[in-house]
């Protein structure tokens, strides 16, 4: 999901963008700040035990348009939001997990055996 209404074709920014990073900090980050020519992101997904985990960081311009589009991934429940409008803009992104589909409950509400289905997040 794009938070700033950009066109889908990735265009080079004239300047570097700084983003908050958490659980996703590259080696060249400092004090949980990374830098990129692309987007800042925040993502929520379930780990193997079904616990929601939030990660945030930088996406390089190359391939980021696809990653930010938040396309469904079979058997994975997750949502990602991307932004570029200011430095550390991803501090203000709060994606939520898409709701469980009814068929996710056929074996009862135990997360680790489910085939989770990803929904677009808007």
């Amino acid at each position: 999901k794009k938070e700033d209404g950009e066109s889908t074709a990735p265009t080079a920014r004239p300047k570097v963008l700084r983003c908050k990073c958490h659980h996703h900090c590259p080696e060249d980050s400092v004090n949980n700040i990374c830098s990129t020519d692309g987007y800042c992101f925040t993502m929520i997904e379930e780990d193997d035990s079904g616990t929601p985990v939030v990660t945030s960081g930088c996406l390089g311009l190359e391939g980021s348009d696809f990653q930010c589009r938040d396309t469904p991934i079979p058997h994975q429940r997750r949502s990602i939001e991307c932004c570029t409008e200011r430095n550390e803009c991803n501090k203000d992104l709060h994606p939520t997990l898409p709701p469980l589909k009814d068929r996710d409950f056929v074996d009862g509400p135990i997360h680790h055996k489910h085939h989770h289905h990803h929904h677009h997040h808007h």
């Epitope: 300047k15 830098s35 390089g60």
Partner: antibody, heavy 116, light 112 residues
């Protein structure tokens, strides 16, 4: 053409503060970061920090935290660096420089002399 | 901080000669985006530095093609194919991959 105008020289007393200016022209001020670099004779170039005029976001070299404060005035496309508690160690040439992913244009520099 | 080690400190050349300046970083300058932010500047006496080469090998606008940059990871080279009088001055390498950004100590290109 891109220009970064800086005063040629400043003379200040030890213990005082000084605010150096850098007026940008020839490009959209908010589209690039502004960096500040210190050069002392025989000491090479030292990166002080940078500011993004579009949101006033700053990054500092740890060495200059508490010494330098970066600000901008977007209405006049001017960047400022305030240096506090000046000592002779602060005597140097200070450059402002336009930064996207690398510095492509430098100001002419301000020679700061700290002397009583 | 990333230490940029430049060699030689001084490079005496004759006009028309080829000159090579080397820069080594204490850690890799390959950024997480895949770009390598290593740049070269020339500073003439009494002037501010001027950009020659950005991102290892890209000549900045107006820079003559006798200047070329190469290298990867931690080792980089600036070559001047035929030195002209206007090329004399101090050459600096600089990295903008890691904060704080750092510079080499400079190489003085002078007439032999």
């Amino acid at each position: 053409q891109v220009q970064l105008q800086q005063p040629g020289a400043e003379l200040v007393k030890p213990g005082a503060s000084v605010k150096l200016s850098c007026k940008a022209s020839g490009y959209t001020f908010t589209s690039y970061w502004m960096q500040w670099v210190k050069q002392r004779p025989g000491q090479g170039l030292e990166w002080i920090g940078e500011i993004d005029p579009s949101d006033n976001y700053t990054l500092y070299n740890q060495k200059f935290k508490g010494k330098a404060t970066l600000t901008v005035d977007t209405s006049s496309s001017t960047a400022y660096m305030q240096l506090s508690s000046l000592t002779s160690e602060d005597s140097a040439v200070y450059y402002c420089a336009r930064f996207g992913y690398y510095v492509d244009y430098w100001g002419l520099g301000t020679t700061l002399t700290v002397s009583s | 901080d990333v230490v940029m080690t430049q060699t030689p400190l001084s490079l005496p050349v004759s006009l028309g000669d080829q000159a090579s300046i080397f820069c080594r970083s204490s850690q890799s300058l390959v950024h997480s985006t895949g770009n390598t932010y290593l740049h070269w500047y020339l500073q003439k006496p009494g002037q501010s530095p001027k950009l020659l080469i950005y991102k290892v090998s890209n000549r900045f606008s107006g820079v003559p093609d006798r200047f070329s940059g190469s290298g990867s990871g931690t080792d980089f080279t600036l070559k001047i194919s035929r030195v002209e009088a206007e090329d004399l001055g101090v050459y600096f390498c600089s990295q903008s991959t890691h904060v704080p950004f750092t510079f080499g100590s400079g190489t003085k290109l002078e007439i032999k």
